[in-house]
C-alpha cells in the first residue's frame, strides 16, 4: 500500500511565438484544476483504458482574469498535492496522464463550463520510496512543470511497497503470517508468494508457489466450492486432495470482480463490467462522486439514481461502460452493407466498399450502365455492381455490340429447321410437330396437344418466336 504524489509547480504559455496570453476564453474569468490518471505498465495504453492504478482531481485554483497589456504569467494553481492512493504493490513502471482543465466562470447556461486545456502523457519507471522526480512537459502551446514520487504507507517498505515491516521500536515478534526479516533488521517481510491465481479468500501457502485450500474449497487455485466438486460430469486436472476431476482454472473463477461486477474472460485475463458507482480493474473503487472525476473520455458526470451509485456518467458518442471507459466496438453492429469492410477511426466510422458499391455505408449499388447504355436495343441489368446487358435477339457480347447467330444453339426441336429472321429466329417444324420451337407433337387426327396452335396457323406452319 502507498500513495503516488504529484506536485504541479507551474502551468503557463510555453516559449516561442503563438503562445496563448490567457487560458480563459473571451467569455470572462476562469480557474484551473488538474486531473491525474495512473495506468500500469509502459505500453502504449489506449487513451480510453481505465486509470487502473487510480486517479485524482485537484481542488480548483484561484480565479484568473486576464490583465490587458500585462505579460502572460504562470497561472495561479490549486494548493496542495494531488494524491493517488494505491492498495496493492507499486508496479514500478507506469503511465502518468496529467490533464489541465479550465472552468469558465462567465455567464454559462447551466453553470460553469469545463474544457480540457492540455493533456500530457509520460511513461515512466519509478521506484517507491525514491526522491521526487522533476519533469517539464509541453502540451500544444502550454508548458507544465511538475514533480512526482511514490511512497509506501501502512508499514510497507521496498521499491514496490510489498514488504511489511515494523518500526524498530516495536516488539520484534512478527504478527500472524509474517516471518522475521534478515537478522540485522528488526523488521518483518511479506509472507511467501503463493501460486499465481491462488484465491486470496480461500487459499493460503506456507511455501512459495503452493496453493493450499481452506476447508470447503478445492481446485488447484482453491476457487471451486467443495460441494460442487463431486466427480460427476467434471473435466479437468485431477485434484490430489479429492481424487475428483475439477474444472481447470479460468480467469473468472471465483469472480475477481467486487461489488456485484460481472466478469468476462479476455485472452489470458479478465475484464470486469462494473455496476454504477464503482470502477477500477476489479470494481473495487467505491464511494466515488462526481468530484472525483470518475467519468473518462469526456463523459459528463451527473448525480446517481440509486442509493448505491452516487454518480452516472453520460458518455459521448463512441464510448460506453459505467465510467465511459470502454470504446464502443461500432463495427460489431456491421454498419457496412454489401460486404463492405468496417474501419473504426475513433472520431468516425468508415466503410471500405467492395467494387460496384459506394456511399457512407456502401448502400449504393453503382449502376455501371449509366452513361454507357447497351447497344442494339439491349437493356441494362444491375447486379452485384457489375455491368451486364440483356441483349435483344441476334446480338450478344458485354454491350450487345456483337452480332449473334440465333440458330447457333440449335433451338428448334424434333428436327425443325432454324431460319434467322430480322426480329429473331423462326423454326420450320418437321411433320407431326408444332410450336415456336417445334416442341409439341401433333396428334394423328390433327388436333394438337396443349397448347393449341394460335388461330391462323396450321400445324407444320413455320412459327415465328416473338
Amino acid at each position: 500500500a502507498g500513495v503516488f504524489e504529484l506536485q504541479i509547480h507551474s502551468f503557463g504559455p510555453g516559449p516561442g511565438p503563438g503562445a496563448p496570453r490567457s487560458p480563459c476564453s473571451a467569455r470572462g474569468p476562469c480557474r484551473l484544476f488538474f486531473r491525474v490518471c495512473l495506468k500500469p505498465g509502459l505500453s502504449e495504453e489506449a487513451a480510453e483504458s481505465p486509470c487502473a492504478l487510480g486517479a485524482a482531481l485537484s481542488a480548483r485554483g484561484p480565479v484568473y482574469t486576464e490583465q490587458p497589456e500585462a505579460p502572460a504569467p504562470d497561472l495561479p494553481l490549486p494548493n496542495g498535492l494531488l494524491q493517488v492512493p494505491f492498495r496493492d504493490a507499486w508496479p514500478g513502471t507506469f503511465s502518468l496522464i496529467i490533464e489541465t482543465w479550465r472552468e469558465e466562470l462567465g455567464d454559462q447556461i447551466g453553470g460553469p463550463a469545463w474544457s480540457l486545456l492540455a493533456r500530457v502523457t509520460r511513461r515512466r519507471r519509478l521506484a517507491a520510496g525514491g526522491p521526487w522526480a522533476r519533469d517539464i512537459q509541453r502540451a500544444g502551446a502550454w508548458e507544465l512543470r511538475f514533480s512526482y514520487r511514490a511512497r509506501c504507507e501502512l508499514l510497507a517498505v521496498g521499491t514496490a511497497c510489498t514488504r511489511l515491516c515494523r518500526p524498530r521500536s516495536a516488539p520484534s515478534r512478527c504478527g500472524p503470517g509474517l516471518r522475521p526479516c534478515a537478522p540485522l533488521e528488526d523488521e518483518c517481510e511479506a509472507p511467501p508468494v503463493c501460486r499465481a491465481g491462488c484465491s486470496l479468500e480461500h487459499g493460503f501457502c506456507e511455501q512459495p508457489g503452493e496453493c493450499r485450500c481452506l476447508e470447503g474449497w478445492t481446485g488447484p487455485l482453491c476457487t471451486v466450492p467443495a460441494s460442487t466438486s463431486s466427480c460427476l460430469g467434471l473435466r479437468g486436472p485431477s485434484s490430489a486432495t479429492t481424487g475428483c476431476l475439477v474444472p481447470g482454472p479460468g480467469p473468472c473463477d471465483g469472480n475477481p470482480c467486487a461489488n456485484g461486477g460481472s466478469c468476462s474472460e479476455t485472452p489470458g485475463s479478465f475484464e470486469c463490467t462494473c455496476p454504477r458507482g464503482f470502477y477500477g480493474l476489479r470494481c473495487e473503487v467505491s464511494g466515488v462522486t462526481c468530484a472525483d472525476g470518475p467519468c473518462f473520455n469526456g463523459g459528463l458526470c451527473v448525480g446517481g439514481a440509486d442509493p448505491d451509485s452516487a454518480y452516472i456518467c453520460h458518455c459521448p458518442p463512441g464510448f460506453q461502460g459505467s465510467n465511459c471507459e470502454k470504446r464502443v466496438d461500432r463495427c460489431s453492429l456491421q454498419p457496412c452493407r454489401n460486404g463492405g469492410l468496417c474501419l473504426d477511426l475513433g472520431h468516425a466510422l468508415r466503410c471500405r466498399c467492395r467494387a460496384g458499391f459506394a456511399g457512407p455505408r456502401c448502400e449504393h449499388n453503382l449502376d455501371d450502365c449509366a452513361g454507357r447504355a447497351c447497344a442494339n436495343g439491349g437493356t441494362c441489368v444491375e447486379g452485384g455492381g457489375a455491368h451486364r446487358c440483356s441483349c435483344a435477339l441476334g446480338f450478344g457480347g458485354r454491350d450487345c455490340r456483337e452480332r449473334a447467330d440465333p440458330c447457333a444453339a440449335r433451338p428448334c426441336a424434333h428436327g425443325g429447321r432454324c431460319y434467322a429472321h430480322f426480329s429473331g429466329l423462326v423454326c420450320a417444324c418437321a411433320p407431326g410437330y408444332m410450336g415456336s420451337r417445334c416442341e409439341f407433337p401433333v396428334h394423328p387426327d390433327g388436333v394438337s396437344a396443349l397448347p393449341a396452335a394460335p388461330p391462323g396457323l396450321r400445324p407444320g406452319d413455320p412459327q415465328r418466336y416473338l
Epitope: G110, P112, C290, V302, G303, G304, A305, D306, P307, H314
Partner: antibody, heavy 115, light 107 residues
Framework: EVQFQQSGPELVKPGASVKISCKAS????????IHWVRQSQGKSLEWIGL????????VYNQKFKSKATLTVDNSSTSAYMELRSLSSEDSAVYFC????????WGQGSTLIVSS | DIKMTQSPSSIYAFLGERVTITCKAS??????LSWFQQKPGKSPKTLIY???RLVGGVPSRFSGSGSGQDYSLTISSLEYEDVGDYYC?????????FGGGTKLEIK
C-alpha cells in the same frame, strides 16, 4: 422535508417563450439531479432532461434539445426550464422532480399555448 | 432510445384481487426501472426503484420483479386507494423513457 415548489400556470401565445421555476428545499441542493418531465393532456410522461447543480452538468432528451433550456441558481436553490418557440403541442403540465430512489416531485406547472 | 412497452393500457379489477402490470424494454435495462403511481390531478409518486426495491412508506402490497427486458408491478390485494395511473420508467440509459401507462379502476 424535501419539497419542490413550482411556478404557477401560464397562458402564452404561439411563438413565445416561457420560463418555469422550481424552488427546492429540505435537502442539500447540489447533491441531486433535478429532472424535468412533461405530461400532455391524457398522455403518458415524457422525460425532458436533467441538470446536476453540483457541476452544472446537463443531459437533454434530443427530442427537447431545441425546445428546452435547463439552468440552476445554487444560491437560491432553484432550477429553471425555459421553453421557446411555443406551439399548441407544447401545452402540457411540466414537472420538476428528483427522480432518484425517493422520487420527490413538484406539483406541476400548467402551460397553455393558445392564440 | 429505449422503448418501454407497458401493458395492459387499462385494468378493471375487484377489491382484494391480485393485479399485475408489465413493462417490456426494447433492450436489457439491467433492472434500472422504477414504478410510479399517479392519481388524477396529482404529481406522480414513486413506488418501486431498481425493479424490486420498495420506496419507504409505500404499502407492502406493492412489489416489483423482473430482469433483463421484462418487468412487472404487482398489487397483492387491491384496495380502493390504489385507483390511478401507473407508469414504469427506465433509467438505464439516457434519455430516460416512460411506459405508456396503465389506468387501474375498480370493478
Amino acid at each position: 422535508e424535501v419539497q419542490f415548489q413550482q411556478s404557477g400556470p401560464e397562458l402564452v401565445k404561439p411563438g413565445a417563450s416561457v420560463k418555469i421555476s422550481c424552488k427546492a428545499s429540505g435537502y442539500t441542493f447540489t447533491d441531486y439531479n433535478i429532472h424535468w418531465v412533461r405530461q400532455s393532456q391524457g398522455k403518458s410522461l415524457e422525460w425532458i432532461g436533467l441538470i446536476y447543480p453540483f457541476n452544472g452538468g446537463i443531459v437533454y432528451n434530443q427530442k427537447f434539445k431545441s425546445k428546452a433550456t435547463l439552468t440552476v441558481d445554487n444560491s437560491s436553490t432553484s432550477a429553471y426550464m425555459e421553453l421557446r418557440s411555443l406551439s399548441s403541442e407544447d401545452s402540457a403540465v411540466y414537472f420538476c422532480a428528483r427522480l432518484n430512489w425517493e422520487g420527490y416531485w413538484g406539483q406541476g406547472s400548467t402551460l397553455i399555448v393558445s392564440s | 432510445d429505449i422503448k418501454m412497452t407497458q401493458s395492459p393500457s387499462s385494468i378493471y379489477a375487484f377489491l382484494g384481487e391480485r393485479v399485475t402490470i408489465t413493462c417490456k424494454a426494447s433492450q436489457d435495462i439491467n433492472s434500472y426501472l422504477s414504478w410510479f403511481q399517479q392519481k388524477p390531478g396529482k404529481s406522480p409518486k414513486t413506488l418501486i426503484y431498481r425493479a424490486n426495491r420498495l420506496v419507504g412508506g409505500v404499502p407492502s402490497r406493492f412489489s416489483g420483479s423482473g430482469s433483463g427486458q421484462d418487468y412487472s408491478l404487482t398489487i397483492s390485494s387491491l384496495e380502493y386507494e390504489d385507483v390511478g395511473d401507473y407508469y414504469c420508467l427506465q433509467y438505464a440509459e439516457f434519455p430516460y423513457t416512460f411506459g405508456g401507462g396503465t389506468k387501474l379502476e375498480i370493478k
